[in-house]
């Protein structure tokens, strides 16, 4: 018996200040671009080394990107999205959605010896 | 894992052409950022071509502007590189890369290390 995998999702705020090479992060998504299956949601898809983002750490690869300075990112072309990363400014201030997975033991057997329930 | 295989290098006379081609394993090619390199015996892996998902915005070293040509077909996840009026001075290995999902920082993804995937590369020899 498998176990199951449940995610355990999170919001937080990020305000990172624009660093010499900009935000360092890629992302991907929108409504003419969806990554993920019936979501056209931005998806935070690469950190760079040494980038702001980075450097701050709290942004993760995965990470859904829901606002930007408080402009709602839903139903945006990717290019779109894009722009208004670009033309954000020097504080930018992120909500973002983190979905951590947590992998479950088989019902029952959970607390009985096995390190992963 | 992205994998990433080209084809289409030789031996060719100066002032002839090539087109390269990069096949990209993976169902979310179409988000790839993909770009050309090339490195010639002791020199640095250089810029020669970029393209952005969609297509819709290339880039280029200023080096090959005019003479090569990049573009790329999502539905055959692959990418390409047009080579014409081909000099001496274009010998070199060819390199392909994909970069996962659009920089919010940089507009012609030049810099390799913006990429995440390369090829093994292929040999264009200029005579």
């Known amino acids: 018996m498998n176990g199951r995998v449940d995610y355990l999702v999170t919001e937080e705020e990020i305000n990172l200040t624009r660093g010499p090479s900009g935000l360092g992060f890629n992302i991907v998504g929108g409504t003419d671009q969806q990554y993920v299956s019936n979501d056209s949601g931005i998806y935070v898809s690469r950190i760079k080394e040494n980038g702001a983002a980075a450097l701050d750490g709290r942004l993760q690869e995965g990470d859904k990107i829901l606002s930007v300075n408080g402009q709602d990112l839903k139903n945006l072309l990717h290019q779109d999205a894009v722009d208004l990363f670009r033309n954000a400014g020097y504080a930018v201030s992120l909500r973002v959605q983190h979905r951590l997975q947590v992998q479950n033991g088989p019902i029952g057997h959970r607390g009985e010896g096995d390190p992963s329930g | 894992d992205v994998q990433l295989v080209e084809s289409g290098g030789g031996l060719v006379q100066a002032g002839g052409s090539l087109r390269l081609s990069c096949a990209a394993s993976g169902r979310t090619f179409s988000t790839y950022a993909m770009g050309w390199f090339r490195q010639a015996p002791g020199k640095e892996r250089e810029f020669v071509a970029a393209i952005n998902w969609s297509g819709g915005s290339t880039n280029y070293a200023d080096s090959v502007k005019g003479r090569f040509t990049i573009s790329r077909d999502n539905a055959k996840n692959t990418v390409y590189l047009q080579m014409n009026s081909l000099k001496p001075e274009d010998t070199a290995v060819y390199y392909c890369?994909?970069?996962?999902?659009?920089?919010?920082?940089?507009?012609?993804?030049?810099?390799?290390?913006?990429?995440?995937?390369w090829g093994q590369g292929t040999q264009v020899t200029v005579s």
């Open positions: 890369a994909a970069a996962i999902g659009s920089s919010v920082d940089s507009y012609d993804h030049s810099d390799p290390l913006e990429y995440d995937y």
